[in-house]
């Protein structure tokens, strides 16, 4: 994909209850299986139909999972991350990073791409400042009439 793609990054705590067939999703990533360049984090690659994650509705394909039951997922081998989920118990708390594309343009496969995004405040602060300056200038102009 050409050009820079910017992302709106948000974090969320998702509590899942393990269903009859488990948690119901697949992951990619790890120190031995980087999915995003320069990032060995763990990403959701698939949400299985009618699984616990799908029925809950909050976890999305492409989300980065930061921790499981408070345990950080940094610098883990892929299989070690898988085992962590499998041994996480009945009630599983996930700290998740959602990334939404905010720039217009073609949406491509996010894997192996540039993980850098811009937080929302970096977008909103300049917009807000410009709005305030414009409003102030308009009021000054009206007073001079």
């Amino acid at each position: 994909m050409n050009g820079r793609v910017d992302y709106l990054v948000t974090e969320e705590e998702i509590n899942l209850t393990r269903g009859p067939s488990g948690l119901g999703f697949n992951i990619v990533g790890g120190t031995d299986q980087q999915y995003v360049s320069n990032d060995s984090g763990i990403y959701v690659s698939r949400i299985k139909e009618n699984g616990a994650a799908a029925l809950d509705g909050r976890l999305q394909e492409g989300d980065k999972i930061l921790s499981v039951n408070g345990q950080d997922l940094k610098n883990l081998l892929h299989q070690d991350a898988v085992d962590l989920f499998r041994n996480a118990g009945y009630a599983v708390s996930l700290r998740v990073q959602h990334r939404l594309q905010v720039q217009n343009g073609p949406i491509g496969h996010r894997g192996e791409g540039d993980p850098s995004g811009i937080p929302i405040f970096m977008v909103l602060v300049p917009v807000f400042a410009l709005t305030m300056v414009a409003a102030w200038a308009f009021m000054r102009y009206r007073q001079q009439l």
Epitope: N26, V28, Y35, V44, K48, V82, F85, H109
Partner: nanobody, 127 residues
């Protein structure tokens, strides 16, 4: 997502060998666990073999153990099924399947629901 295309099927005599290939498009192939299934006319789909994303783990159905060998070449985006000592009961359409990523649940490579991408199949006939 990747697309899967099988090749290498054909007609072979009992005791002979065939090598099936499953070529995947797309650069994400190395994240996929891959499997082979088969379906004979009037029968249910049957698990043949599977291989992990890294190639470190392989799995086989009881009916093919010791005769079939699965392998993969991530540089060529291809998974192979070497079939030796073929029997007439191996006659079927052979399907390649892929699962994007590793399930965080108990893994059953013989469960078709584990796989999210399927090829169109290649016919193998053993006379």
């Amino acid at each position: 997502d990747v697309q899967l295309v099988e090749s290498g099927g054909g007609l072979v005599q009992a005791g002979g060998s065939l090598r099936l290939s499953c070529a995947a498009s797309g650069r994400t192939f190395r994240y996929y666990s891959m499997g082979w299934f088969r379906q004979a006319p009037g029968k249910e789909r049957e698990f043949v073999s599977a291989i992990s994303w890294s190639g470190d783990s392989t799995y086989y159905g009881d009916s093919v153990k010791g005769r079939f060998t699965i392998s993969r070449d991530n540089a060529k985006n291809t998974v192979y099924l070497q079939m030796d000592s073929l029997k007439p009961e191996d006659t079927a359409v052979y399907y390649c399947a892929g699962a994007f990523g590793s399930t965080v649940d108990n893994y059953d490579p013989s469960d078709p629901r584990e796989y999210d991408t399927w090829g169109q199949g290649t016919q193998v006939t053993v006379s």
